[in-house]
Structure formats: structure tokens, C-alpha cells
Interface confidence: low
């Protein structure tokens, strides 16, 4: 399951309840076409690792959280572990994001 | 532009209490996480705790649980840092801070707390 | 909880002399910040994530390590950058290294 970002507190709010776990977080945009392509991916990526906690962040519902977390284009993929962020890279990347996953977890 | 303005200096008698307060403008507290930062006469900084204002949610370093009591009130964006118990080891400069991860963080200008 | 040691404690260097300290954490973290701090005034964010300046920080100053092992170095000393640093983690509690205080000679 992918849960939704819909402030800067919920946010922080789900790195802190993370605990140990990996949490994976997409930032993208309605109109970004690269975004809707691997939506489904980044979907069936939560379903395979539920040891993981996978956050979708819309830039433009949530200019605070981008703009703290810098994220300069989309898909912007950042990594989380006990509330530091452990990776990042931009791009629809299927088989990055799936590899840094399993390197991170 | 994002400030905090911490209150003023305090001078208590061992045993008492103290209640620190750290006003924000240029920002809602409700957006971030608050956190309170100690410093000891010519030592370090030691991280005291932090608290979500959106829902009083508080997270304290175990050498400060007992000691410290971190609360907020939205209604005027304020964030405070209780110290019960002082003793001589409370005498310190007593930051508020917005810590964030990859954005500017911002301090407060500190309050200083003698314990005599 | 993670321990930040920092070295040395007091160091002094002369103008245009290249500057480097160290902090090593008792555990694994992923990014180091750090921070400058000079008498009477609030600590300041100098180096976040490792390696990237803060704004306004001089392209003197450079950011790196990994795992247990990071550096703090000045490539030419000035006489501005006399002030105390600290490192500091941001795992689920926060930790300061104890500073090191750096001196003009």
C-alpha cells in the first residue's frame, strides 16, 4: 500500500513511525507523464516488499515537502531509513529504483 | 522570513521550575517538528527533544525524560520547554530550533538559564 | 543511541593553512551535518548531507565521509572561520559531536 503525503507534519510524521524500516518516497506531479508510467511499478513495489513503507508526495499539493526535501524534477525518488534520507535519484527508472530498494533494505 | 524569538533570560533558585517559550513567525509550527538544544557554559550542544505541534506528540533524549516537558499552542505559534527540579547542571544557554532535513535549519537566539 | 567523537578537540591554524577535522560515530549513518558556532551566537548549519555547503558558506569549506568515518575540511584558512564546530547526526534521536574549537594562529 502507498500512502498519500498530504502535509509537511505527515511527512515527518511517517519517517518517525517508520521506526527501522526503509521508507521509499516518489515525488511526482500529475502532469508528469515519466510519473504516471511508473506509478503502477512503484505500486506493485509496495505490494512485493511489505517490509517497506512506500509515500507518494504530489509536488504541487505539497510545495512544502518538495522544497524541504529539495526535489528539483520528477519522478524524484529519495530513500529514508530512522529518519535520514539514505539515497536519492531522479528519473522513471524501474530496475534503479527496484535494485536501490533490495541495496537499502 | 522564517524567525524565532526565545524569551528572556532567567535566574531560579535551585529546586525550582522554568518554563522556556519560542515564538515563531514566518511559518506555521503545525508544519514541522519543534526542537529544544542545550548548551552548558564552554561545552557542546546536547539535543533535548522535539515535539509535532500538530498533535503534541513528543520525543525526548532518555537523559532528559523526567527533566524536561516540551508543549506547544498553535494559537500563537509558540513552542515551550519546561525544566523541572534545577540544580546547578541546568545552568545553560537553551535553544529552540527548526531542524530540517535538507532546507535551511533555523535557531532561536537562545535563552540562558542560571540555576543559583 | 549514536556517539559523535570529534578530533581534535582544539586545533589553530595560520592564514591560508588547509584545515581538517574529523568525527567518527559509534554506528553506521548515512549523512552527516555540520555546524559553526562562534561565542555569543546560535549555532549555524554549515555542511548538510554529508558534502553540500549551506548557503552562503565559502567554497573553502568541503563535507565528506561515509558509514562511521566523516571529515570537515577547509582547503585555506581565514581568519573568519575561527569558531567552534560541531558535528551531528539525525538518526530517531539526535546527537552533537562535543566540538572542535578551531583557532587562529
Known amino acids: 500500500m502507498v500512502k498519500q503525503i498530504e502535509s509537511k507534519t505527515a511527512f515527518q510524521e511517517a519517517l518517525d513511525a517508520a521506526g527501522d524500516k526503509l521508507v521509499v518516497v516518489d515525488f511526482s506531479a500529475t502532469w508528469c507523464g515519466p510519473c504516471k508510467m511508473i506509478k503502477p511499478f512503484f505500486h506493485s513495489l509496495s505490494e512485493k516488499y511489505s517490509n517497506v513503507i512506500f509515500l507518494e508526495v504530489d509536488v504541487d499539493d505539497c510545495q512544502d515537502v518538495a522544497s524541504e526535501c529539495e526535489v528539483k524534477c520528477m519522478p524524484t525518488f529519495q530513500f529514508f531509513k530512522k529518519g535520514q534520507k539514505v539515497g536519492e535519484f531522479s528519473g522513471a527508472n524501474k530496475e534503479k529504483l527496484e535494485a536501490t530498494i533490495n541495496e537499502l533494505v | 522570513e522564517v524567525q524565532l524569538q526565545q524569551s528572556g533570560a532567567e535566574l531560579v533558585k535551585p529546586g525550582a521550575s522554568v518554563k522556556l517559550s519560542c515564538t515563531a513567525s514566518?511559518?506555521?509550527?503545525?508544519?514541522?517538528?519543534m526542537h529544544w538544544v542545550k548548551q552548558r557554559p564552554e561545552q557542546g550542544l546536547e539535543w533535548i527533544g522535539r515535539?509535532?505541534?500538530?498533535?503534541?506528540?513528543?520525543k525526548y533524549d532518555p537523559k532528559f525524560q523526567g527533566k524536561a516537558t516540551i508543549t506547544a499552542d498553535t494559537s500563537s505559534n509558540t513552542a515551550y520547554l519546561q525544566l523541572s527540579s534545577l540544580t546547578s547542571e541546568d545552568t545553560a544557554v537553551y535553544y529552540c530550533a527548526l531542524l530540517q532535513y535538507s532546507a535551511m535549519d533555523y535557531w532561536g537566539q537562545g535563552t540562558s538559564v542560571t540555576v543559583s | 543511541q549514536i556517539v559523535l567523537t570529534q578530533s581534535p578537540a582544539i586545533m589553530s591554524a595560520s592564514p591560508g593553512e588547509k584545515v581538517t577535522m574529523t568525527c567518527s560515530a559509534s554506528s553506521r549513518i548515512s549523512y552527516m551535518y555540520w555546524y559553526q558556532q562562534k561565542p555569543g551566537t546560535s549555532p549555524k548549519r554549515w555542511i548538510y548531507?554529508?558534502?553540500k555547503l549551506a548557503s552562503g558558506v565559502p567554497a573553502r569549506f568541503s563535507g565528506s565521509g561515509s558509514g562511521t568515518s566523516y571529515s570537515l575540511t577547509i582547503s585555506t584558512m581565514e581568519a573568519e572561520d575561527a569558531a567552534t564546530y560541531y558535528c551531528h547526526q539525525r538518526s530517531s534521536y539526535p546527537t552533537f559531536g562535543a566540538g572542535t574549537k578551531l583557532e587562529l594562529k
Open positions: 515535539i509535532d505541534p500538530a498533535n503534541g506528540n513528543t
Open positions: 548531507d554529508t558534502s
Open positions: 514566518g511559518f506555521n509550527i503545525k508544519d514541522t517538528f
